[in-house]
Interface confidence: medium
């Protein structure tokens, strides 16, 4: 039996299609401001967006098994539709100006449309034909259409106000919508032609749906749900009154989700997404930044990309021809991300959270979350404040500085402590970057009145000051072993400089229009940096051919940036510390001749076997 479903801020309700029946709330907890609504009839589930929580959720019709399926990177997800054949979820976000897709459980998320979108609002799917339709509310309101993979985009209805409630009559092949500027209910054929006004005397129609011979709509002025004949607009009936702010309305019935396409059968044999395209075809789609393999069925994860962090988010960006948009990685419980790094071998992301005073790691999909360094060591009555980190991928160690103890620590990637490698009465090590290819680490030392940039062997020995003049607050370091260059940003002097790894050939790379540089990274021939005050990522071509370029603007609360290059496994295995840490119990160092020597943290000494460390 068909019935109406509608979202009304803090609840989602159902009501009979007939008049004067009571509406019944679906027992859902934690709904704050439900906006868009849709269903999957075969699963007997409803899906909704919440513009206060900035989530997309689902539950069974009885309210059970409530779960958030998308909870990152949403701003105002005000349009949403279920692809019942491909088992995909589509949504439009007026804040991010993106139309995205994922599986119904939120997996394999991809951005389909992101260029030249101005406040996309209502969204409707025609999966049997392979088209999606949406309205835009921006400077030039319109109704657009594209294939369900985002291709073949075209404007169908250019001369329209803010169109809402976009609905498809699948049987008669017509589009219906409400116009919030003209207060009309209109209809057209599937090409936007043959346009007809169905109702022109309504005070404020908002949401709209169609079922059999009727259209059903909500009216914000009359505070009602009403219906009328879908072609003539006659035989009007109020289904229910006294309803404020009904956001979306739909008819729950299997006839609204019929048809067939290739995606309905074994996901089109696609490894990730199966996306319908006209007419009746499909393409396999990949999660954001993944690439489709030559078999046109399976996908490969990106191996080269940029990570950048904001206060409570870590984002990934790829540099490609399509100018693919950056995405937020679905990592929970980020409070105040200060620094990030990446292990390309295990494909794990590492970060320092300065609110929780810990170092954590996780996979890019948010799974396998693990605390590597905890905020306090009760047995030693020791509070720590990690400041910066750098991974030695060969020895599988993290080098990290601590604001509370003013030392450089080494911890295994599995969280076991190696020990302190650098500690001094006057020392205040802050930024740190390791160069395990040569056996060195570089760090900024923000001593009172005499900031320095220093170099030391990875065990803290062979320590030397590279720079002590022309520095005020060197806040960030980056290193490129291939180029043999060290880079640093000084947030007080507002400039970015570089030198050779020995400290020779110091030059100022950029010192104009930099306000608050807080992070640096090298990516191919480009040096990228983030400016927290200008909320911007910029880059400069180190070959001098292309100069300085803005990469992205309007990114609030930036904290760090890190380039990830594809790991050459053959090269990796040739590093003498890559095999079982070179046989060393603690620190493995590469000597100038390419051989290794073992060493120890400060509290231990090297034993006679020259491999193991023990108590002095």
């Amino acid at each position: 039996e068909a019935f109406l479903l509608f979202s009304r801020r803090a609840d989602i309700r159902r009501i009979s299609l007939e008049t004067n029946n009571n509406n019944v709330a679906i027992p859902l907890t934690g709904v704050k401001e439900a906006s868009a609504l849709d269903f999957d009839v075969t699963d007997n589930r409803i899906y909704w967006t919440d513009i206060s929580l900035k989530t997309i959720s689902r539950a069974f019709m009885n309210g059970s098994a409530l779960e958030h399926v998308v909870e990152f990177g949403l701003d105002y997800p005000e349009g949403m539709a279920v692809d019942w054949l491909g088992k995909n979820l589509y949504w439009a976000d007026t804040g991010t100006n993106r139309i995205e897709v994922s599986k119904l459980d939120g997996q394999h998320r991809q951005v389909l449309v992101w260029k030249d979108l101005d406040s996309p609002r209502a969204l409707a799917l025609d999966p049997a034909e392979g088209f999606m339709y949406w309205t835009e509310w921006g400077g030039k309101p319109k109704i657009d259409r594209a294939a369900m993979d985002g291709s073949e985009r075209t404007t169908l209805v250019p001369n329209v106000g803010r169109a809402n409630g976009l609905t498809i009559d699948y049987a008669k092949r017509r589009l219906y919508w409400t116009d919030l500027d003209t207060n009309l209910i209109e209809s057209s054929n599937m090409l936007g032609l043959n346009r007809e006004v169905i109702a022109d005397d309504l005070p404020h129609p908002f949401g709209l749906t169609q079922y059999q011979d009727y259209i059903y709509w909500t009216d914000w002025s009359r505070r009602s749900i009403e219906r009328a004949n879908k072609t003539s607009g006659q035989n009007r009936t109020i289904i229910q009154g006294h309803l404020d702010y009904v956001m979306d309305i739909l008819v729950f019935h299997s006839s609204r989700q019929s048809g067939w396409n290739e995606c309905a059968s074994s996901n089109g044999h696609c490894s990730h997404l199966c996306l319908a395209v006209p007419v009746g075809g499909f393409v396999c789609g990949c999660p954001a930044h993944y690439s489709l393999n030559a078999d046109n069925r399976t996908c490969s994860a990106p191996t080269t990309f940029l990570l950048f962090s904001q206060k409570s988010a870590i984002n990934r960006m790829v540099i490609d021809e399509q100018q693919s948009p950056d995405i937020i990685l679905p990592i929970h419980s980020l409070r105040n991300v200060r620094a990030i790094d990446y292990d390309p071998l295990d494909k794990q992301l590492y970060w320092i959270d300065s609110r929780q005073n810990m170092i954590r790691k996780a996979q890019e999909d948010g799974s396998q979350g693990f605390t590597v360094v905890v905020s306090s060591v009760p047995s030693q009555n020791l509070e720590i404040q990690p400041y910066d980190l750098s991974i030695d991928i060969y020895s599988r160690y993290i080098y990290w500085t601590c604001e509370a103890t003013n030392v450089i620590n080494v911890t295994r990637l599995d969280g076991r402590s190696v020990g302190v490698v650098l500690k001094g009465e006057q020392d205040r090590p802050r930024a740190v970057v390791v160069n395990p290819e040569k056996g060195y680490m570089y760090f900024t030392n923000l001593q009172e009145r005499s900031p320095k940039i220093e170099r030391a062997a990875l065990d803290g020995t062979e320590r030397e000051v590279l720079f002590f003049s022309g520095l005020s607050k060197p806040i960030a370091l980056a290193l490129d072993s291939r180029l043999g260059k060290l880079f640093w940003a000084d947030s007080d002097l507002r400039r970015i400089e570089s030198s050779d790894l020995s400290g020779a050939n110091r030059i100022v790379l950029e010192d104009s229009n930099i306000l608050q540089p807080v992070g640096l990274t090298v990516f191919e021939n480009w040096l990228y940096w983030i400016d927290k005050q200008q909320q911007m990522i910029e880059k400069i071509d180190m070959t001098g051919r292309e100069g300085r370029t803005k990469v992205q603007a309007r990114i609030a609360q930036l904290s760090d940036i890190h380039a990830v290059k594809e790991l050459n496994l053959q090269e990796y295995r040739q590093h003498p510390c890559a095999q079982d840490n070179g046989g060393c119990s603690h620190i493995c160092l590469v000597k100038g001749d390419g051989t290794t020597r073992c060493s120890c943290p400060m509290h231990l000494v090297l034993l006679q076997d020259e491999l193991s460390c023990g108590e002095p």
């Epitope: 401001e33 906006s35 206060s52 007026t94 101005d118 509310w137 400077g139 803010r162 500027d181």
Partner: nanobody, 119 residues
Framework: DVQLVESGGGLVQAGGSLRLACAGS????????IAWYRHPPGNQRELVAM????????DYADSVKGRFTISRNNAMKTVYLQMNNLKPEDTAVYYC????????????WGQGTQVTVSS
Amino acid sequence: DVQLVESGGGLVQAGGSLRLACAGSGRIFAIYDIAWYRHPPGNQRELVAMIRPVVTEIDYADSVKGRFTISRNNAMKTVYLQMNNLKPEDTAVYYCNAKRPWGSADEYWGQGTQVTVSS
């Protein structure tokens, strides 16, 4: 983010006119309710006029009906308040406010512009 900048305030004689403008930046200015509030000296802030994205919906405070007119130009992301037949009791700091028509998820305020009506 939506940022609001008011202009057009000033000193005017009773019976005179002023036109306030509220310029908005931000991608979704056109889908917000825009309102003018005022904060008279020694009193509470009060709603003067509101215009919804649906242009037919306009509300005025009883004290300004027939004298003030609110209008919006979505293309220019600007909302105007035409104030005629001003009275000394209209003296206040006038603020522009932008709020989503549904729910309390977002609300923005301008810095305000001073209107002084002398008798």
